[in-house]
């Protein structure tokens, strides 16, 4: 079939049919890329948008039931989603265990062990208690 593109006027000739490039006047939204059609245009959408003009928000929570890990709750948003993490977890998908030792008050000389939403202190000899702040009576 005869196919000619005249750059000056954005005209395409397909067979005997004249087809104008509709992309200069496109209205693809939310990062959509215009793809010319016959007497119309279409939009190629980024992953978080859908619909003919990329105006419909993709519900990632519906499409990816495990989008949020470790018991996190998925919240759909325009152009994406977010996770509300349960205690002890953080990160975009709640996959990062919060370092509770960063805020721990284990007595100096003791070793902090991070757990999920908690920590424990490993006491040196002669110390006892949750924070290793007590003298161990057994060693006195």
């Amino acid at each position: 079939a005869h196919h000619h593109h005249h750059h000056g006027e954005n005209l395409y000739f397909q067979g005997s049919e004249r087809n104008i490039d509709d992309c200069p006047n496109h209205r693809c939204q939310n990062g959509g890329v215009c793809v010319d059609g016959v007497n119309t245009y279409n939009c190629r959408c980024p992953p978080q948008w859908t619909g003919q003009f990329c105006t419909e928000d993709v519900d990632e929570c519906l499409l990816q039931p495990n989008a949020c890990q470790n018991g996190g709750t998925c919240a759909n948003r325009n152009g994406g989603y977010g996770c509300v993490c349960v205690n002890g977890w953080s990160g975009d998908d709640c996959s990062e265990n919060i370092d509770d030792c960063a805020f721990a008050s284990c007595t100096p000389g003791s070793t902090c062990i991070d757990r999920v939403a908690s920590f424990s202190c490993m006491c040196p000899e002669g110390k006892a208690g949750l924070l290793c702040h007590l003298d161990d009576a057994g060693n006195s």
């Epitope: 006047n25 496109h26 209205r27 939204q29 939310n30 990062g31 003919q52 003009f53 105006t55």
Partner: antibody, heavy 120, light 107 residues
Framework: EVQLVESGGGLVQPGGSLKLSCAVS????????MEWVRQASGKGLEWVAA??????????VYSASVKDRFTISRDDSKSTLYLQMNSLKTEDTAVYYC???????????WGQGTLVTVSS | DIQMTQSPSSVSASVGDRVTITCQTS??????LAWYQQKPGKSPKLLIY???RLQDGVPSRFSGSGSGTDYTLTISSLQPEDFATYYC?????????FGGGTKVEIK
């Protein structure tokens, strides 16, 4: 809160120039198409010009009535949209509105408007 | 350019009335239609986008319908604050075009 505030309107003689500004806040400026729409006194709304977003290379479209006379531009660092108007005609007299294209094929936020009067 | 034919140009109605405004486009706009309300001396306010989607914060007495080339805005029970001018606008392609407006006046 999304806000758009136009400025730069005034009285100008036919053939003169004027530059309108639209300062925006409350959203990521580069993510949105921005539009200029005008309204002559007692008349309807008329679209003037648009600048698409960063994802669409900030490409520009004009109405036939202002093409080659008006220039739309933006400064992302200042979150400001501009409309440079040259070779003004009496029929360009109108309130000029800056608006945000909200990603739904509709203009979801508008400025208060700035009046441009072209008269000798 | 896509032509927009909005009717009626004005309508007189009373509080509590049902008001219907229509908009016809010169070609299929694939539901890319918005409705705006404008009061004297004020900026337009978006009511409906995508032909039938209610913009956040807009009362549910406003509704939109239609597809292809024929669209309708309905105010189910007119309130005192609804007396204004209403415009349709196609967002399918540039140049964006508006209907001529419908002034809703107090009977």
């Amino acid at each position: 809160e999304v806000q758009l505030v136009e400025s730069g309107g005034g009285l100008v003689q036919p053939g003169g120039s004027l530059k309108l500004s639209c300062a925006v806040s409350g959203f990521t400026f580069s993510d949105f198409y921005m539009e200029w729409v005008r309204q002559a006194s007692g008349k309807g709304l008329e679209w003037v010009a648009a600048q698409r977003n960063k994802a669409n290379d900030f490409s520009i479209v004009y109405s036939a009535s202002v093409k080659d006379r008006f220039t739309i531009s933006r400064d992302d660092s200042k979150s400001t949209l501009y409309l440079q108007m040259n070779s003004l005609k009496t029929e360009d007299t109108a309130v000029y509105y800056c608006s945000r294209d909200g990603g739904r094929l509709a203009l979801d936020a508008w400025g208060q408007g700035t009046l441009v009067t072209v008269s000798s | 350019d896509i032509q927009m034919t909005q009717s009626p140009s004005s309508v007189s109605a009373s509080v509590g009335d049902r008001v219907t405004i229509t908009c016809q486009t010169s070609e299929d706009i694939y539901s890319g239609l918005a409705w705006y309300q404008q009061k004297p001396g004020k900026s337009p306010k978006l009511l409906i986008y995508g032909a039938s989607r209610l913009q956040d914060g807009v009362p549910s007495r406003f509704s939109g319908s239609g597809s292809g080339t024929d669209y309708t805005l309905t105010i189910s029970s007119l309130q005192p604050e609804d007396f204004a001018t209403y415009y349709c606008q196609q967002g399918f392609k540039y140049p964006l075009t508006f209907g001529g407006g419908t002034k809703v006046e107090i009977k």
